[in-house]
Amino acid sequence: EEELQVIQPEKSVSVAAGDSATLNCTVSSLIPVGPIQWFRGAGPGRELIYNLKEGHFPRVTPVSDPTKRNNMDFSIRISNITPADAGTYYCVKFRKGSPDVELKSGAGTELSVRAKPSAPVVSGPAVRATAEHTVSFTCESHGFSPRDITLKWFKNGNELSDVQTNVDPAGKSVSYSIRSTARVVLTRRDVHSQVICEVAHVTLQGDPLRGTANLSEAIRVPPFLEVTQQSMRADNQVNVTCQVTKFYPQRLQLTWLENGNVSRTEMASALPENKDGTYNWTSWLLVNVSAHRDDVKLTCQVEHDGQPAVNKSFSVKVSAHPKEQGSNTAAENTGTNERNIY
């Protein structure tokens, strides 16, 4: 009598998550009688997946009618596949007994599950940085299988090269995660810039997933300060202007000091945006020259985005302004524009 064979024709089967997997198995004989059981894995720790005779397996259905006369097809269909179903499945013939005795196993079919990566999530630095500094962006995507995946970074459409990417775990797993860090050197023009993390995977049919981050969340553009004096007015008042330009974000407080004493404090709000995304702001201070015997030291003090204040000081020469004079005299600039303070 010819020895019974258990035939699993496919060495491997690949299925998309959510689909059904068909695992084929046929036997060469009805004899000896006894159940066919399906297991995932081999050895003592193997997991019973299906037993035609005993138990209930709601996700598993036989492909052929097992009650059909001379049925030798014990293929099964597993519904709603998830990455957790990946593994090697064995079709095993048992001889009827008390208990049933294992007779022969098929060679096994490896089920791999193609699972889509999750939408990439891009996170930027916790604190803002200024131009010429390097900031790191992180991109994460999870739950994909197989392990092969491509991740690219772009800034304003140009691929970034200072990138470090890891796929975990390194060994075999039901699903994988990717984490990538891109280092970006900021420029003053980056308020409107965007970084894109692009993930390509076999499950995406050539339509990669993208995660984005705006550099506006990561950049601080410190302001330029310029203080100028307008011409003396007929009423002996001098108009002094503090121009704060090219700053981002908008969060800014400006304080005028006269000879070191606070004269006025203003908060920037609802400013029009420049083309490059930065803001400008102009503040005026009227100084009554006739009320001063000596020169007046004016300071425009700007506190931007919680950073240390930047000062621009300026002296109004009282002696240079006879009461009747109305000419436009240039102010002496005694202040310094302290920028890039951390």
């Epitope: 004899i31 009688v33 005779k53 009618d65 006369r69 001379n70 049925n71 009827k96």
Partner: antibody, heavy 121, light 111 residues
Framework: EVKLEESGGGLMQPGGSMKLSCVAS????????MNWVRQSPEKGLEWVAE??????????HYAESVKGRFTISRDDSKSSVYLQMNNLRAEDTGIYYC????????????WGQGTTLTVSS | DIVLTQSPASLAVSLGQRATISCRAS??????????MYWYQQKPGQPPKLLIY???NLESGVPARFSGSGSGTDFTLNIHPVEEEDAATYYC?????????FGGGTKLEIK
């Protein structure tokens, strides 16, 4: 351990009705075809009826001698199979066995101890 | 219906000898290379017990002194060497087609 336990037998008059029950244990009842076979000194062993699985739409088959009079049914939730017998005749007298079909081929591997039906006036 | 005829109706065999029981079907019970014939043993007050399935295969737990053979319409049950506990009535049964039928039985007596 596989067990099949019949009940419901007794003495009946011709033309009467009776329902036999069989409770199964020790195996996944819903996965097996079930049968009734009867035995009498006159006719020996005689297959009576078979009921298949839910996946077979609970298909039933009967011996010609009982067709139209007997009805086999099952309740998988109770691991039970039944034989409703109407219009009973003297020749229906015998021991009725509840049987598990192991391999969907009248492979009668487990039999109950039987319940006796006597049809007599 | 397929009629199964068993012979002899009864036989007496000495302890340790061979008992041979025949079962003839009125029509072939073989399909696709398989012989749909079964053999049972029944002792008084007990239900039948399956011995042989598909003509020649020993049911689990049945002693190897029981064997079956045959194909098509002619089938044989052999018991060798016969033991005292083998005294019983033996039945053949087919599942070649519906309805399933049984042979009339062979009563084995041990001498």
């Amino acid at each position: 351990e596989v067990k099949l336990e019949e009940s419901g037998g007794g003495l009946m008059q011709p033309g009467g009705s009776m329902k036999l029950s069989c409770v199964a244990s020790g195996f996944t009842f819903s996965n097996y075809w079930m049968n009734w076979v009867r035995q009498s000194p006159e006719k020996g062993l005689e297959w009576v009826a078979e009921i298949r699985l839910k996946s077979n739409n609970y298909a039933t088959h009967y011996a010609e001698s009982v067709k139209g009079r007997f009805t086999i049914s099952r309740d998988d939730s109770k691991s039970s199979v039944y034989l409703q017998m109407n219009n009973l005749r003297a020749e229906d007298t015998g021991i009725y066995y509840c049987i598990r079909d192991y391999d969907y081929d009248a492979y009668f591997d487990y039999w109950g101890q039987g319940t006796t039906l006597t049809v007599s006036s | 219906d397929i009629v199964l005829t068993q012979s002899p109706a009864s036989l007496a065999v000495s302890l340790g000898q061979r008992a041979t029981i025949s079962c003839r079907a009125s029509k072939s019970v073989s399909t696709s290379g398989y012989n749909y014939m079964y053999w049972y043993q029944q002792k008084p007050g007990q239900p039948p017990k399956l011995l042989i399935y598909l003509a020649s295969n020993l049911e689990s737990g049945v002693p190897a002194r029981f064997s079956g053979s045959g194909s098509g319409t002619d089938f044989t049950l052999n018991i060798h060497p016969v033991e005292e506990e083998d005294a019983a009535t033996y039945y053949c049964q087919h599942s070649g087609e519906l309805p399933y039928t049984f042979g009339g039985g062979t009563k084995l007596e041990i001498k």
